[in-house]
Interface confidence: low
Amino acid sequence: EAHKSEIAHRYNDLGEQHFKGLVLIAFSQYLQKCSYDEHAKLVQEVTDFAKTCVADESAANCDKSLHTLFGDKLCAIPNLRENYGELADCCTKQEPERNECFLQHKDDNPSLPPFERPEAEAMCTSFKENPTTFMGHYLHEVARRHPYFYAPELLYYAEQYNEILTQCCAEADKESCLTPKLDGVKEKALVSSVRQRMKCSSMQKFGERAFKAWAVARLSQTFPNADFAEITKLATDLTKVNKECCHGDLLECADDRAELAKYMCENQATISSKLQTCCDKPLLKKAHCLSEVEHDTMPADLPAIAADFVEDQEVCKNYAEAKDVFLGTFLYEYSRRHPDYSVSLLLRLAKKYEATLEKCCAEANPPACYGTVLAEFQPLVEEPKNLVKTNCDLYEKLGEYGFQNAILVRYTQKAPQVSTPTLVEAARNLGRVGTKCCTLPEDQRLPCVEDYLSAILNRVCLLHEKTPVSEHVTKCCSGSLVERRPCFSALTVDETYVPKEFKAETFTFHSDICTLPEKEKQIKKQTALAELVKHKPKATAEQLKTVMDDFAQFLDTCCKAADKDTCFSTEGPNLVTRCKDALA
């Protein structure tokens, strides 16, 4: 239904707290360099204006679209061109082009310092002094570093953060209470960020149809008792919610997500028997819970998929009459039978089925042609299954850090032109798949591994798009989203690469490494490992292991030495010589 004032409508629906949080996220995601105080001032102005519209929907400017209101606010910021360069050119455009322009200037890798967590006492003091400002800072800092973070979900993480601080700041040992809990929230939020970015990439590159197909597969796996009409309705609504968030329409997105959660809770009988626990929770927790609810029990009496999609005499007729609906029912039926497959795999199978029908339905004897289609799925299914087995075996043997190193070597060989920081970040993230997925029950491993890897590789593609340097990466990133992971897995050593010169300074370390936290130490060592591979792309695993063991031993010895500086300056050059010899 149309509202006289869109901003008043959203303020009323969302309430002041969520309204302000979402506006802050929106501004922080668009203008990623502005300080919290600058954004907080804008948010207050927008909120005050919304309140005047709530009081009188006919008041001046209350009938303007949210894009117009928000865009005008952003364009009024002083020194926009000095701080943001060509983004300021967006302000010369009219809506909707102005918003599109803002979206195109979102930076997936902004040059901001890492978000450092203050020490416990300081955090608790500032939280107690002003919890609202404290949480505002959290929203601002996360949103500007992750310009596509799913806004209503970020409000959920802020709520989690708030609850943890409320609990832990009352404890004697604040540090040991806060650290593991906040680390847990951070890990989940980072995964949520790459997953959502993947959804926005799907939407931006391949349109709503591609996203809707993803949603149908995912929802059919989770709700196998829901009928196709129900799944289609949920997928359509979910597509709308994600389109809005990816497009910067955060108030609409959060409002529609709340509506979808309400609908699901009011229609449990036609959706799933597993929803009640989620539906008992307050809004943010409810929507989060529904998004990761366990799969419902599969109906016991599902007929074989072949009946309707291979053996039925009307296959080509049904396909020709309504291609999208027929393929949609195939995806639904296959997905509800296979909660053990990844969504990417299910979409590859649907694509294979579509290609088979396109080819066979044009032939003289279609049934003879498409009769073997299900058997042709076998290699497509075996490939990710083998990937999971091989990688989980390796993870179990090496542990997370060793597994990350193995992936780092593999990916540096595949794409040695990619910058070392990007390779290290990618390998560390890809390596976490072991901890995240390999410990799960067998039937949950494949969906966990492949869908997580796809999301991480999407980030690799986004970073590479900014400065394309590797033909290998460009080739894999320009294909369809669901083919990316198999494409990257199939890459081998890049034979076109001219090895890097050996530079001693790349492998020269100083005593300051000794005081770094363990994570930073690992990154330093992994940076050296990537550089070694760039110098010797065809080095064997044994050679690299020898060098890295020697390097670890060197660090251990010098960090324990009484005179660390002397140890590093005398032993360092010897290490460099030994490395060169080992790789000769």
Partner: nanobody, 115 residues
């Protein structure tokens, strides 16, 4: 198609009793928690009581605790509400709902308690 049909309402004197039934069809009844909700004239829906799928866990609104009892028979796909010591303020249309939702998907049954 999901269907919920309530019955058992009527006019009763203050202090009297009624037993409401709700016949369910079109879904796996035993897998879902169920609730009773009521709506008095001119007021919003008010949640009354809930029961889990197996029938072991029951919950009540403060206003009906000790007077009303919710139960279910999964074999018959039926939900019940035994209402004792009825008061005039219990006058409302009573609906059964799936889960613990206050949304009304059925016709309801009228309960009128006269003083």
């Amino acid at each position: 198609e999901v269907q919920l049909v309530e019955s058992g309402g009527g006019l009763v004197q203050s202090g009297g009793s009624l037993r409401l039934s709700c016949a369910a069809s079109g879904f796996t009844f035993g897998s879902f928690g169920m609730s009773w909700v009521r709506q008095a004239p001119g007021k919003g829906p008010e949640w009354v009581s809930a029961i889990d799928g197996g029938g072991a866990d029951t919950r009540y609104a403060e206003s009906v605790k000790g007077r009303f009892t919710i139960s279910r028979d999964n074999a018959k796909k039926t939900l019940y509400l035994q209402m004792n010591s009825l008061k005039p303020e219990d006058t409302a249309v009573y609906y059964c709902t799936i889960g613990q939702s206050t949304s009304r998907g059925s016709q309801g049954t009228q309960v009128t308690v006269s003083s």
